[in-house]
């Protein structure tokens, strides 16, 4: 648990920038939670560096991270999920830098999945649906979702829609006819827990119908 220097042999190491960031994922593997940390500078020599978390744990003082290439990772049931933990970068027993972090404020949800788009000819709209593993979770159940879509030819012209449900209706008249669209979705905690956007879901591609000249409406696909 020591956060103090035991000797003076690490002066060079102390000149380096050991700033890091972390995110937590709750109930990511059954009832197990995970915590992932990484250095912000990709050029940090991580050879002898370890991460340790102390405090706000169940019946243990501290836990050590596992190193997985450039990231440091813990999977455990032992997060109290209240209050701040002390997360330190260490060389041996010496702490190089520490951060006090409340794991409930750095939650990164799992990416949504099973994104699909169904065209309803009679309603002249597209029903977007997707799934999230968080519907089954005890903790991070309430999410805000960000659905982003674009015409495939418009490289960076994304339209975003925020919603709390897993279903969205896009009106046909708001989309270009006979065009290929890409759509994707991500999630962020929206109640009690705070944190970061999930990774994007895999993209789904759909084509809008042609305009029917006699009625001025789009043809179904």
């Amino acid at each position: 648990e020591s956060g103090y220097a035991q000797n003076g042999d690490l002066e060079d190491a102390e000149l380096d920038d050991y700033s890091f960031s972390c995110y937590s994922q709750l109930e990511v593997n059954g009832s197990q939670h995970s915590l992932t940390c990484a250095f912000e500078d990709p050029d940090v020599n991580i050879t002898n560096l370890e991460f340790e978390i102390c405090g706000a744990l169940v019946e243990v003082k501290c836990l050590n991270f596992r190193k997985l290439q450039e990231i440091y990772f813990i999977e455990t049931k032992k997060f109290l999920l209240i209050g701040k933990s002390n997360i330190c970068v260490k060389v041996g027993e010496k702490s190089l830098t520490c951060k006090k972090i409340d794991l409930t404020t750095i939650v990164k949800p799992e990416a949504p999945f099973d994104l699909s788009v169904v065209y309803r000819e009679g309603a002249n709209d597209f029903v977007v649906t997707f799934n999230t593993s968080h519907l089954q979770k005890k903790y991070v159940k309430v999410l805000m979702h960000d659905v982003a879509y674009r015409q495939e030819k418009d490289e960076n012209k994304w339209t975003h829609v925020n919603l709390s449900s897993t279903k969205l209706t896009l009106l046909q008249r708001k989309l270009q006819p006979a065009a290929m669209y890409e759509i994707k979705v991500r999630s962020i905690p929206d109640h009690y827990f705070k944190g970061f956007w999930s990774e994007w879901s895999p993209s789904y591609y759909f084509r809008t119908p042609e305009i029917n000249n006699s009625s001025g409406e789009m043809d179904p696909i």
Epitope: G3, Y4, G55, L57, L80, I82, G83, K84
Partner: antibody, heavy 119, light 105 residues
Framework: QVQLVQSGAEVKKPGASVKVSCKAS????????MNWVRQAPGQGLEWMGL????????SYNQKFKGRVTLTRDTSISTAYMELSRLRSDDTAVYYC????????????WGQGTTVTVSS | EIVLTQSPATLSLSPGERATLSCSAS?????MHWYQQKPGQAPRPLIY???KLASGIPARFSGSGSGTDFTLTISSLEPEDFAVYYC????????FGGGTKVEIK
């Protein structure tokens, strides 16, 4: 103001159980841990365990594990400590104490509940 | 489990004198807290995270230390300061020291 009010004194026989309550007011009950600390007559302080009122997760001092059970009722902002298989050396004042999660010290204490174990 | 040893067990001083209370840990501790307890009362927090004054605590109280050695200092004792003082480690299992009684000489 922030307050913790504990239930009254108890007299129990060896082998029995006791359940002490701690009613919180003046703050968001689910935002802080509730800790239990005991003090035998003329002795020091001994941490027994804590509960996270938000999710019911508990952490116990190994010395008491298996004998102490911490629970809470969020609807009435009340925490409970039950100690079973009582012995005479469990005679003590039992305190509930709010845990400040930023610094992990006990910033608000109940008035204490005296539990006497005697045959 | 870390053992916290407080010394001296009893400190006999007069009002106006300086009190220095020690807390020694059996292994390194990141943060230490201090509490005051008067007879028949619950403990009350004095100092948290080594040197930060708890709410409502006068500035004559101060804390210092690192690693295994921590100190609570009362710069000039007031009559209401005669009590028992406990140190406590910040992390599981939140161990308390045995206490130092500050009594009137």
């Amino acid at each position: 103001q922030v307050q913790l009010v504990q239930s009254g004194a108890e007299v129990k026989k060896p082998g029995a159980s006791v359940k002490v309550s701690c009613k919180a007011s003046g703050y968001t009950f689910t935002g802080y841990t509730m800790n239990w600390v005991r003090q035998a007559p003329g002795q020091g302080l001994e941490w027994m365990g804590l509960i996270n009122p938000y999710n019911g997760v508990t952490s116990y001092n190994q010395k008491f594990k298996g004998r102490v059970t911490l629970t809470r009722d969020t609807s009435i902002s009340t925490a409970y400590m039950e100690l079973s298989r009582l012995r005479s050396d469990d005679t003590a004042v039992y305190y509930c104490a709010r845990g400040d999660g930023n610094y992990w010290y006990f910033d608000v204490w109940g008035q204490g509940t005296t539990v006497t174990v005697s045959s | 489990e870390i053992v916290l040893t407080q010394s001296p067990a009893t400190l006999s001083l007069s009002p106006g004198e300086r009190a220095t209370l020690s807390c020694s840990a059996s292994s390194s501790v990141t943060y230490m807290h201090w509490y005051q307890q008067k007879p028949g009362q619950a403990p009350r927090p004095l100092i948290y995270e080594i040197s930060k004054l708890a709410s409502g605590i006068p500035a004559r109280f101060s804390g210092s230390g690192s690693g295994t050695d921590f100190t609570l200092t009362i710069s000039s004792l007031e009559p209401e300061d005669f009590a028992v003082y406990y140190c406590q480690e910040w992390n599981y299992p939140y161990t308390f020291g045995g206490g130092t009684k500050v009594e009137i000489k």
